[in-house]
Interface confidence: medium
């Protein structure tokens, strides 16, 4: 059986949420039992079709209604022929979409005016992914390449922070991290040495 994937490039890039049909052409075999495989595991998808072009030529389709990141991978089709399994050339399916967060800012409890850091990381595809930081509804810096660390010199009240990740497909917003004030016991050095003034912000990753 001359087995090949037909009508699809070796690398296929699809946007998240879009449908995709992979085609597999089997020639030189009557009534092949075509199986689709993804990353080594047989795809148990009942949306598989077979078209007899002629007695010895069949096309198999694998239909995905709405691709997501987990559908990305290496696909091939295979048939059994005389007790041996023949496999096709693979198709690498890349699923592009808005950035996906791998690290989001976490809630913190800090003493008044004490410095702290928040982290944010997002990935594509497509790359590059850039990060913008927000304090409440105020944009406080960016864009900067992912991953990004926000260095804050201190806060004097409970404050909310979030990051936003951008790529060519759009943007995604992270969870909102709440930075709570940690109560400092009376008489502590922190209480004596820090004055209640507007916090200063340092964003080294946004500076030239």
């Amino acid at each position: 059986a001359g087995l090949k994937l037909m009508g699809a490039p070796v690398k296929l890039t699809v946007s998240q949420g879009q449908p995709v049909k992979l085609n597999c052409s089997v020639e030189g075999m009557e009534e092949p039992d075509i199986q689709w495989v993804k990353d080594g595991a047989v795809v148990q998808n009942l949306d598989q079709l077979y078209i007899p072009v002629s007695e010895q030529h069949w096309i198999g389709f694998l239909s995905l209604k709405s691709v997501e990141r987990s559908d990305a991978g290496r696909y091939w089709c295979q048939v059994e022929d005389g007790g041996e399994t023949e496999i096709s050339q693979p198709v690498w399916l890349t699923v592009e979409g808005v950035p996906f967060f791998t690290v989001e800012p976490k809630d913190l409890a800090v003493p008044p005016n004490a410095p702290f850091q928040l982290s944010c990381e997002a990935v594509g595809p497509p790359e590059p992914v850039t990060i913008v930081w927000w304090r409440g509804t105020t944009k406080i810096g960016g864009p900067a390449p992912s991953p990004s660390v926000l260095n804050v010199t201190g806060v004097t009240q409970s404050t909310m922070f979030s990051c936003e990740a951008h790529n060519l497909k759009g943007l995604a917003s992270s969870r909102t991290a709440t930075v709570h004030l940690q109560l400092v016991p009376r008489g502590s050095s922190a209480h004596h040495h820090h004055h209640h003034h507007h916090s200063a912000w340092s964003h080294p990753q946004f500076e030239k």
């Epitope: 039992d33 795809v43 009942l46 079709l49 077979y50 078209i51 007899p52 239909s63 209604k65």
Partner: antibody
Framework: EVQLVQSGADVKKPGASLTISCQAS????????ISWVRQKPGKGLEWMGQ????????MYGPSFQGHVTISADRSTATAYLQWRSLEASDTAMYYC??????????????????WGPGTLVTVSS | SYELTQPPSVSVSPGQTARITCSGD??????AYWYQQKSGQAPVLVIY???KRASGIPERFSGSSSGTMATLTISGAQVEDEADYYC???????????FGGGTKLTVL
Amino acid sequence: EVQLVQSGADVKKPGASLTISCQASGYTFTDYWISWVRQKPGKGLEWMGQINRHASNTMYGPSFQGHVTISADRSTATAYLQWRSLEASDTAMYYCVRSGGATSGGTIPEYYQHWGPGTLVTVSS
Amino acid sequence: SYELTQPPSVSVSPGQTARITCSGDALPKKYAYWYQQKSGQAPVLVIYEDWKRASGIPERFSGSSSGTMATLTISGAQVEDEADYYCYSQERKGNYFVFGGGTKLTVL
């Protein structure tokens, strides 16, 4: 013309075994899969399972796994649904359906469009 | 196990638009199919792959799918459309199919 001819109605006692059949004609049997669907009296449709084009692989709905066996004979273009031990709750109409598989001329997928007339199975003591 | 949820009944007057919904967690990823079953008859395929009309089905029948909800719409319902309607789809991994509980459409 596509036809799915099912075996006749049957009355059995609880604990009895039973096999019902679905013979296909008007198309190449190995171009399509066959599904079985149950409908209890006055109730909705339930997908039981299906057998692939080459009668080499079966899939079952969670409620039916282990309770029924789906098989097929390619030489006679016939699919079967078998019980080893019937229960009163198996009383229902059973339909076979042509599903999956090839498409006519490679255009419109007509899978799930052709149904047998149904086989009524009554299990009563 | 996976479930598809339909309203038990929908009633419309002749000429009105009937909408029957089907809800399932996997519907963003899996196609919905719709069947019509009249009393004492085998089901008939009406819509496949969310929105495609099966051969021989009148144009007043249409289908759509958005998120976890699939919808069968009958624009200008007629008395002969009175039947039970079932949605049909796969569970998320594609290991088995499921029917919805069915919706009885009354056109009075």
